[in-house]
Interface confidence: medium
């Protein structure tokens, strides 16, 4: 993170209403934070969503934005018919402009577009538009969902009534009615072409208060395929001042947006004000938590025959799952543990969002494979109690999976948790490795901007003489689609020894819906050759594990040095035709709760690997030398190992596992703060015995790694 | 960080009167400020609110008997139209909404022919 | 309009508990606060957000808040206690935005 210091008083821009130009002839002014008197304000920390009542009373209101729309609970208006758009299929002129806001990415529309119908009062022109996105890896970055379901990113479109006023701002600072358009953008395999000059104008933004000319582009090819289906309700800005102004019309179908297409918006900067310090970081989580719906009711269009084939494949079974199905997001800090020689203790932490509460349990979920033949058993944990599961009778020849899932009121489950992979035996083929996140199950290369070359850890646990080992794999994306080819031999196989070094591709995650029906035994897995497993479908279900958790970013409830359970004023709460019920005790006032408040979230940090030997072609194990070097434990509660006594944290045995990379940044730290890659990767030369010993710094800092990066044959680097 | 109101005195009913709060140690650009008021023997009861991008929040009683307004330092409340009624102490607090642990001493304000 | 009830007066004995009430048509819906006031004194801030403490409040008072009611209890109560307790709450949207008072508990400790 750059500090620098700055000598001008904290105040704001970028809020809905003060992004206007003073450009090119325009009437209209982008207010620059030192000349403006409004609030400074952020999405995280002292000035997060949850302060902004401090500055802003109306964002205290019953009728803020975004909530959580639930279908079955929006009723049709008959008045709600279809949009009528005018301008929308002109090519833009290249007069059209965006900007860096610090809070958004915006563009400024210099043509006449116009909307009517859809019950707004009157002819609105568009003014401008802004996107709001996650931290990566197409985890939830929208600030509206259906059914509980988030998207990547989220488009807002604004407009005005040009026949009552003169200009937006006007519209804004007289608390008139306002009409916005929200548009999600969900994963898609390949690039959406319609896209490309807004990501060619996001590369040219990347800083703050950066200011770039589009391309040409069609407004028209940036909404849905299909208008017909949305739904409207009455809101507010989602940022400050938080105004009740505001029409929304949310259009239920998604624009697809490829990962690579996603990544110009996690290469974003910005700059956050504490104090009189400034400092810059990634541009990323920019959405405000999610509100109660109070007294309003959200309505859905009565255009004919829209609804029909959208209903079963999107919102039923949107890409292959059932988000409305998901009560929260997955269980973390998934770690397993030897008690003795035999017996094994799972422990983790509840999920961060818990969209349904309350939870009523947990299901700890764990499949071994004996003799080529699998078993699993599947048991249930109060979740009043410790976090924790003992698993008794552990078989030093068998290879353990465990997974997670929590359960809420009405068998709402959770997404899984990150799988773990434990394994206790003598030839300790997957000794330590721990298969870090990647998060793309479609092998695209990492950005630039956020290529870390981050390790993939390991933890050799030894009890009684008896050396244990454990593989951890994210679930990916999952909820994932079952339609995924590979198999799970194939999945679990090549994902360990991509780990490993032996792969010919890209590590994929391991998808959440693949759980083994047939597990590989150590030898097997010794002997197959690894294939990267490009679970693309899996690629095209947002929520997951970092899908709908959107990290508690400011510390919701916290002030003074203590924790709350609640939000600032209503946010980040949701409920639905339900106003005056609590879901919980401890939840009384949230229907979404944090439970992860100002603390490492999700991912552990990564620490270096274990030493496995492999062969110069990487493809087989040589047995016979497996040397007991010791390796740090993975702490999976947040960026800090503890290395035991007499252990350096810092100081541990290189190997040449190569370093999973990955996009995923881990939630662990604030998503704020970025990490700072070194941007060349290590020449294939660079090669280090296995007694070379080097510095990790601490992955808390996430500026650099000392991890080696071995060549494998076809990885991406 | 501190407040103060000034500004209270004996007026005669029907004489408008304004109250200010000067702070410091805080920008007003980035917090509410509101006006509360206590009656003799009475308890505390809001008047209105002006918060950082100055929007204005009223009571419903004392819309069109009361004006908030401020400056870069300071928070100003008009009475419009006093009466007998509106004889009380008047304090200013800052952001109050979800609990101000800033408030000033007060300022009594007393209305009498 | 949004009202907030609470008990004209309470009585405790000197190093007992006792429990301010208010309550309101939907205050689970919204964040109680609560304020201590004596005589001749501006208030002070005791609970925010129905259960936080600012710092420099003794940890004897303590808010919760369960169905329509919001409750500070005072625990240990002692002399200096003695004092008349508000609670508040916001309601509204938007420009009809509006802050509400309750009309206050007298304390008196015995």
């Known amino acids: 993170v750059l500090h620098y210091v700055v000598c001008f008083p904290a105040l704001t821009e970028g809020y809905v209403g003060a992004l206007h130009e003073n450009r090119h002839g325009s009437a209209v002014q982008i207010r620059r934070r030192k000349a403006s008197g409004d609030p400074y304000w952020a999405y995280s920390g002292a000035y997060g969503p949850e302060h902004w009542v401090t500055s802003s009373v109306s964002c205290g209101g019953r009728h803020q934005s975004p909530i959580d729309i639930l279908d079955q609970y929006a009723r049709v208006g008959e008045e709600y018919q279809e949009l009528q758009l005018d301008g929308f299929d002109n090519e833009s002129s290249n007069k059209t402009w965006m900007k860096n806001t610090g809070k958004t990415v915006a563009i400024l529309l210099k043509d006449d577009y116009f909307v009517s119908g859809a019950g707004l009062p009157g002819r609105f022109k568009a003014e401008k538009v802004e996107f709001h996105w996650g931290h990566s890896n197409g985890s939830a970055g929208s600030e509206h969902s259906i059914n509980g379901r988030r998207f990547p990113v989220e488009m807002q479109i604004f407009f005005y009534n040009p026949d009552d006023f003169d200009s937006f701002q006007t519209a804004i600072s007289e608390n008139r009615i306002i009409g916005a358009m929200a548009i999600f953008f969900q994963v898609s395999p390949r690039d959406n072409s319609a896209l490309d000059p807004i990501i060619h104008g996001l590369k040219g933004v990347v800083h703050h208060e950066k200011e770039t000319f589009l391309d040409p582009f069609v407004l028209r090819d940036l909404l849905p395929a299909s208008l017909g289906s949305y739904y409207r309700y009455t809101g507010s800005l989602t940022t400050p001042p938080c105004s009740e102004i505001v029409e929304w019309i949310v259009f239920r179908r998604p624009v697809p947006i490829s990962y690579h297409q996603l990544e110009a918006f996690y290469s974003i900067f910005t700059t956050e004000q504490q104090d009189h310090v400034k400092s810059v970081e990634y541009l990323r989580n920019n959405f405000r938590p999610q509100q109660r719906l109070h007294d309003r009711v959200v309505s859905k269009s009565a255009v004919r025959d829209s609804w029909n084939h959208d209903m079963t494949d999107f919102l039923e079974n949107p890409l292959g799952t059932e988000a409305s199905k998901v009560c929260s997001s997955p269980p973390i800090h998934m770690k397993v543990q030897p008690l003795n020689q035999t017996a094994l203790q799972v422990s983790w932490s509840q999920p961060e969002t818990i969209y349904h509460p309350p939870i009523m349990n947990y299901m700890i979920s764990y499949s071994w494979t004996k003799n080529e033949d699998e078993k699993e058993k599947t048991f249930t944990k109060d979740s009043d109690k410790d976090l924790k599961a003992t698993i008794s009778h552990v078989s030093p020849d068998s290879l353990y999976l465990f997974r997670v899932q929590a359960v809420c009121r009405n068998d709402m489950r959770s997404d899984f948790s990150q799988t773990m992979l434990f394994q206790a035996n003598t030839t300790r083929i997957f000794q330590g490795t721990r298969i870090v996140k990647t998060g793309v199950p479609t092998a695209s290369p990492a950005s630039s901007a956020d290529m870390a070359p981050i390790s993939s850890g390991s933890s050799t646990w030894t009890s009684s003489g008896i050396p244990f080992s454990f593989v951890s794999m994210a679930t990916g994306m999952g909820p994932s689609s079952s339609g995924s080819q590979a198999t799970v031999a194939s999945v679990v196989t090549s994902t360990l020894l991509a780990g490993l070094g032996f792969g010919g591709g890209g590590i994929s995650s391991f998808p959440s819906t693949v759980w083994p029906t047939r597990l590989p035994t150590a030898a097997s897995a010794s002997k197959q050759a690894a294939r990267p497993v490009l679970a693309t479908t899996e690629a095209l279900a947002s929520p997951g594990p970092d899908g709908d958790s959107s990290p508690t970013k400011d510390g919701e409830g916290t002030e003074e040095g203590e924790k709350d359970e609640k939000s600032e004023s209503e946010d980040g709460e949701r409920e639905h035709e339900e106003d005056g019920e609590k879901d919980s005790e401890k939840k009384e006032k949230s229907g979404v709760t944090h439970a992860a408040e100002e603390r490492n979230q999700t991912e552990p940090s990564p620490t270096p690997s274990s030493p496995n030997r492999t062969a110069e072609g990487g493809h087989q194990t040589i047995p016979g030398h497996e040397q007991d070097h010791t390796a740090v434990p993975t702490d999976q509660t947040g960026g800090r190992r503890d290395a035991g006594p007499g252990l350096d944290p810092d100081m541990v045995t290189s190997t040449q596992v190569p370093p999973t990379a990955t996009e995923e940044q881990y939630a662990g730290s604030d998503p704020k703060r970025p990490e700072m890659p070194s941007k060349k990767p290590m020449s294939r030369g660079d090669r280090f015995s296995e007694d070379s010993r080097f510095i990790t710094v601490n992955p808390a800092e996430k500026n650099t790694s000392g991890m080696i990066s071995r060549p494998a044959p076809g990885r991406m680097e | 960080q501190s407040l103060e109101e000034s500004g209270g005195r004996l007026v005669t009913p029907g004489t408008p009167l304004t109250l200010t709060c000067t702070v410091s140690?805080?920008?007003?650009?980035?917090?509410?400020m509101s006006w509360v008021r206590q009656a003799p023997g009475k308890g505390l009861e809001w008047i209105g609110t002006i918060d950082g991008y100055g929007y204005t929040y009223y009571a419903s009683w004392a819309k069109g008997r009361f004006t908030v307004s401020k400056t870069s330092t300071t928070v100003d409340l008009k009475i419009t139209s006093p009466t007998t009624e509106d004889t009380a102490t008047y304090f200013c607090?800052?952001?109050?909404?979800?609990?101000?642990?800033?408030w000033g001493p007060g300022t009594l304000v007393t209305i009498s022919s | 309009s949004f009202v907030l009830t609470q008990p004209a007066s309470v009585q405790v004995n000197l190093g007992q508990t006792v429990s301010l009430t208010c309550t309101a048509d939907?205050?689970?819906?919204?964040?109680a606060s609560w304020y201590q006031q004596k005589p001749g004194q501006a208030p002070v801030l005791l609970i925010y957000?129905?259960?936080s403490r600012p710092s420099g409040v003794p940890d004897r008072f303590s808010g919760s808040s369960s169905g329509n009611t919001a409750t500070l209890t005072i625990s240990g109560a002692q002399a200096g206690d003695e004092a008349d307790y508000y609670c508040a709450t916001a309601d509204g949207s938007g420009s009809s935005y509006q802050f509400v008072f309750g009309g206050g508990t007298q304390l008196t400790v015995t």
């Open positions: 939907t205050l689970s819906r919204r964040y």
């Open positions: 957000r129905d259960t």
């Open positions: 607090a800052r952001e109050i909404y979800l609990g101000s642990n800033f």
């Open positions: 140690g805080f920008s007003l650009s980035s917090n509410a």
